[in-house]
């Protein structure tokens, strides 16, 4: 059974992940329209189901494309200090949270998503899991 310390650690990791995803989303929402329009042609895959930590496998598999689009879209109005480090940190958290005991084959929804929809989906996921832990 999970101990209170392991639950607290999971909660802190989820909060860290949530903040990272929100930071990216805030940066994107600050884009001027034409640039955002171009970014929205970059497609992301969404999980068919995301209700448990193990479903973070679906986020892990889309981190490379996320890093790509953030690198491509850097500008004065949106400059992440180091995209590679940010994605690497997210990846570390995701790996710890989902665990490695069971390797899940991610099931994706038929419809793809824009970067904004993709980030919102995973932000909602983090918020939902955090609320069950508190």
């Amino acid at each position: 059974a999970p101990t209170s310390s392991s639950t607290k650690k999971t909660q802190l990791q989820l909060e860290h992940l949530l903040l990272d995803l929100q930071m990216i989303l805030n940066g994107i929402n600050n884009y001027k329209n034409p640039k955002l329009t171009r970014m929205l042609t970059f497609k992301f895959y969404m999980p068919k189901k995301a209700t448990e930590l193990r479903h973070l496998q679906c986020l892990e598999e889309e981190l490379k494309p996320l890093e790509e689009v953030l690198n491509l879209a850097q500008s004065k109005s949106f400059h992440l200090r180091d995209t590679k480090d940010l994605i690497s940190n997210i990846n570390v958290i995701v790996l710890e949270l989902k665990g490695s005991e069971t390797t899940l084959m991610c099931e994706y929804a038929d419809e793809t998503a824009t970067i904004v929809e993709f980030l919102n989906r995973w932000i909602t996921f983090c918020q939902s899991i955090i609320s069950t832990l508190t």
């Epitope: 034409p34 497609k43 895959y45």
Partner: antibody, heavy 121, light 113 residues
Framework: EVQLVQSGAEVKKPGESLKISCKGS????????IGWVRQMPGKGLEWMGI????????RYSPSFQGQVTISADKSISTAYLQWSSLKASDTAMYYC??????????????WGQGTTVTVSS | DIVMTQTPLSLPVTPGEPASISCRST????????????LDWYLQKPGQSPQLLIY???YRASGVPDRFSGSGSGTDFTLKISRVEAEDVGVYYC?????????FGGGTKVEIK
């Protein structure tokens, strides 16, 4: 090896229908846009439109909207370009090309060998 | 639509000599304040499919020799070949992907003198 293989040359009469294909291999076909480019005899390249096979999201250049239909079958990693009623002016070489996860942020890095379409009575 | 204009239409070249092709767009191809310039160069060799040479203004595509280079800013762009080789003959096209629909230049035919 990453490649796009197109269907063979076609000779058709005006008013006939046609569907040409472009089969991708060696990469995740569903995760990259596939564009279609026309080259009329002795002329330059014209960008016709594009499809994302993962969800069949399709965008057409205004010049080609309503003239052709772009589709894809992700189960067999194939994109299609079709005409319901061919005209003599559709005589051209047609190329498919891969364009990454966003057609704004990636060049057309892999091209098919082209399909020659001849429309003549 | 963004119109792409290439000059010259035809370019006779001498092997070993440099060559330069110009491309002009009707609006700036800069993506955002200091983002990427969304311009590519393609080469179509005789009887072949086009191939990507240079992407995002100045990045050489995989396998492209370093004698090819792309430069420019805003609306004026140049493709340079430092020392032309016989295998470089064909038609060169610039293409913008800043705005939909994507558009090609009319092409520049490079041939050996």
């Amino acid at each position: 090896e990453v490649q796009l293989v197109q269907s063979g040359a076609e000779v058709k009469k005006p008013g006939e229908s046609l569907k040409i294909s472009c089969k991708g291999s060696g990469y995740s076909f569903t995760s990259q846009w596939i564009g279609w480019v026309r080259q009329m005899p002795g002329k330059g390249l014209e960008w016709m439109g594009i499809i994302f096979p993962g969800d069949s999201d399709t965008r057409y250049s205004p010049s080609f909207q309503g003239q052709v239909t772009i589709s894809a079958d992700k189960s067999i990693s194939t994109a299609y370009l079709q005409w319901s009623s061919l005209k003599a002016s559709d005589t051209a070489m047609y190329y498919c090309a891969r364009q990454g996860r966003s057609y704004h942020y990636y060049g057309m890095d892999v091209w098919g060998q082209g399909t020659t379409v001849t429309v003549s009575s | 639509d963004i119109v792409m204009t290439q000059t010259p239409l035809s370019l006779p070249v001498t092997p070993g000599e440099p060559a330069s092709i110009s491309c002009r767009s009707t609006q700036s191809l800069l993506d955002g304040d200091d983002g990427n310039t969304l311009l590519d160069w393609y080469l179509q060799k005789p009887g072949q499919s086009p191939q990507l040479l240079i992407y995002t203004l100045s990045y050489r595509a995989s396998g492209v020799p370093d004698r090819f280079s792309g430069s420019g800013s805003g609306t004026d762009f140049t493709l340079k070949i430092s020392r032309v080789e016989a295998e470089d003959v064909g038609v060169y096209y610039c293409m913008q992907r800043l705005e939909f629909p994507l558009t090609f230049g009319g092409g520049t035919k490079v041939e050996i003198k």
